[in-house]
């Protein structure tokens, strides 16, 4: 997992690499000079658009070696014990709500992204946090409002699919009867943030190999 | 470069019904929050209607809620206003506004289409 | 709501004098989320200044904003023939978003 220092290095794309470039070269020019990041991925992007198939080439070469190596790696790769055991999960339930926040994000992560093409996916998420920070409380409202509804729109549907009776194989992930209702819901609740993180992250992962191929 | 243009206009009866277009071009128009914004013959300019990007989320302003709806499409690069129950103090040129996300300052505007509402 | 009052109504310049708008909030603007606005006769408003003193894309700069809270002021700092027109200001730093009523900017 996210914690595995023996895990491999993810493989970076070519556009990674020139920003790698970009960097080294700015360092070398001004080895004392902060950084101002904002500034320095919009120059990046700028001069990147402005490339040739062939100048871009070199980096496409690296990009490709990289995957290889990550392939390579991630076949003698043996994850910890316990990681692989993925929590059953039944295709035909109903799909946790997303937050307020949640939706805010899947609404301005396209601009980031298309507007800072080298943004890594934390420096995505981080952007898109302070814009959630600037944003006033009576603005948030339309997103909690929508938010609400879906979550009272997920307990309908929970209950109804509760009701009809969890196949046999999900059964035997549910939580001990004895649990106290109020700590089932706690630990729903736990699951509610674990996955939603899970599906930003999927959904950048897979955004990440779309820029990748363009 | 960046063109908003807008179109719909007219006169129109009292209870009448309209609806307005604004067709987009020169950017990612599905990255953008939209706005419809009003202006009544020689007087100031007032906010109507606002959609995100997706057009999953809409505000409106207290004076036409219940009788606009905002939409868009964005695989058309379009922005809609649907008025129905138009009142003779709806007279005004409307126009389109690009913004930046949440309430915002309009970098881009349509050169607007006038709507009288009169019997 | 917060309610943003201009002043003066119309200002009566000559060419290359400087032009002093003021625009005041009844309640302080939120991170100073203030726009300025120009509008002429028969033209959609064009934004010339954000967060109070941020000029936007291809505005000379003869023009300059300041303030903060509830008081804010627009400079043309050399009056050209064609910047006699109607100018606005907007809060955007809460909902809903408001104009002031138009400063009005002559000939003499």
């Known amino acids: 997992g996210k914690g595995d220092p023996k895990k491999p290095r993810g493989k970076m794309s070519s556009y990674a690499f020139f920003v790698q470039t970009c960097r080294e070269e700015h360092k070398k020019k001004h080895p004392d000079a902060s950084v101002n990041f904002s500034e320095f991925s919009k120059k990046c992007s700028e001069r990147w658009k402005t490339m040739s198939a062939k100048e871009k080439g070199k980096f496409e070469d690296m990009a490709k070696a990289d995957k290889a190596r990550y392939e390579r790696e991630m076949k003698t790769y043996i994850p910890p014990k316990g990681e692989t055991k993925k929590k059953f999960k039944d295709p035909n339930a109903p799909k946790r709500p997303p937050s307020a926040f949640f939706l805010f994000c899947s609404e301005y992560r396209p601009k980031i992204k298309g507007e800072h093409p080298g943004l890594s996916i934390g420096d995505v998420a981080k952007k898109l946090g302070e814009m959630w920070n600037n944003t006033a409380a009576d603005d948030k409202q339309p997103y909690e409002k929508k938010a609400a509804k879906l979550k009272e729109k997920y307990e309908k549907d929970i209950a109804a699919y509760r009701a009809k009776g969890k196949p046999d194989a999900a059964k035997k992930g549910v939580v001990k009867a004895e649990k106290s209702k109020k700590k089932k819901e706690e630990e729903e609740d736990e699951e509610d943030e674990e996955d939603e993180e899970e599906e930003e992250d999927e959904e950048d992962e897979e955004e990440e190999e779309d820029d990748d191929d363009e | 470069e960046v063109q908003l243009l807008e179109s719909g206009g007219g006169l129109v009866q009292p209870g009448g019904s309209l609806r307005l277009s604004c067709a987009a071009s020169?950017?990612?128009?599905?990255?953008?929050d939209m706005w419809w914004v009003r202006q009544a013959p020689g007087k100031g300019l007032e906010w109507v209607s606002?959609?995100?990007?997706?057009?999953?989320?809409?505000a409106y302003a207290d004076s036409v809620k219940g009788r606009f709806t905002i939409s868009r499409d964005n695989s058309k690069n379009t922005l809609y206003l649907q008025m129905n129950s138009l009142r003779a103090e709806d007279t005004a040129t409307y126009y389109c506004?690009?913004?930046?996300?949440?309430?915002?300052?309009?970098?881009?505007w349509g050169q607007g289409t006038l709507v009288t509402v009169s019997s | 709501d917060i309610q943003m009052t201009q002043s003066p109504g119309t200002l009566s310049l000559s060419p290359g004098e400087r032009a002093t708008l003021s625009c005041r909030a009844t309640?302080?603007?939120?991170?100073?989320?203030l726009a300025w606005y120009q509008q002429k006769p028969g033209q959609a408003p064009r934004l010339l200044i954000y967060?109070?003193?941020s000029r936007a894309t291809g505005i000379p700069d003869r023009f300059s904003g300041s303030g903060s809270g509830t008081d804010f002021t627009l400079t043309i700092s050399r009056l050209e023939p064609e910047d006699f027109a109607v100018y606005y200001c907007?809060?955007?730093?809460?909902?809903?978003?408001?104009f002031g009523q138009g400063t009005r900017l002559e000939i003499k």
């Open positions: 020169g950017f990612t128009f599905s990255w953008y």
């Open positions: 606002w959609i995100v990007p997706s057009g999953g989320i809409t």
């Open positions: 967060d109070a003193s």
């Open positions: 309640q302080s603007v939120r991170k100073n989320f």
């Open positions: 506004a690009r913004g930046n996300y949440g309430p915002s300052p309009f970098d881009y």
């Open positions: 907007q809060q955007y730093g809460n909902s809903p978003i408001i």
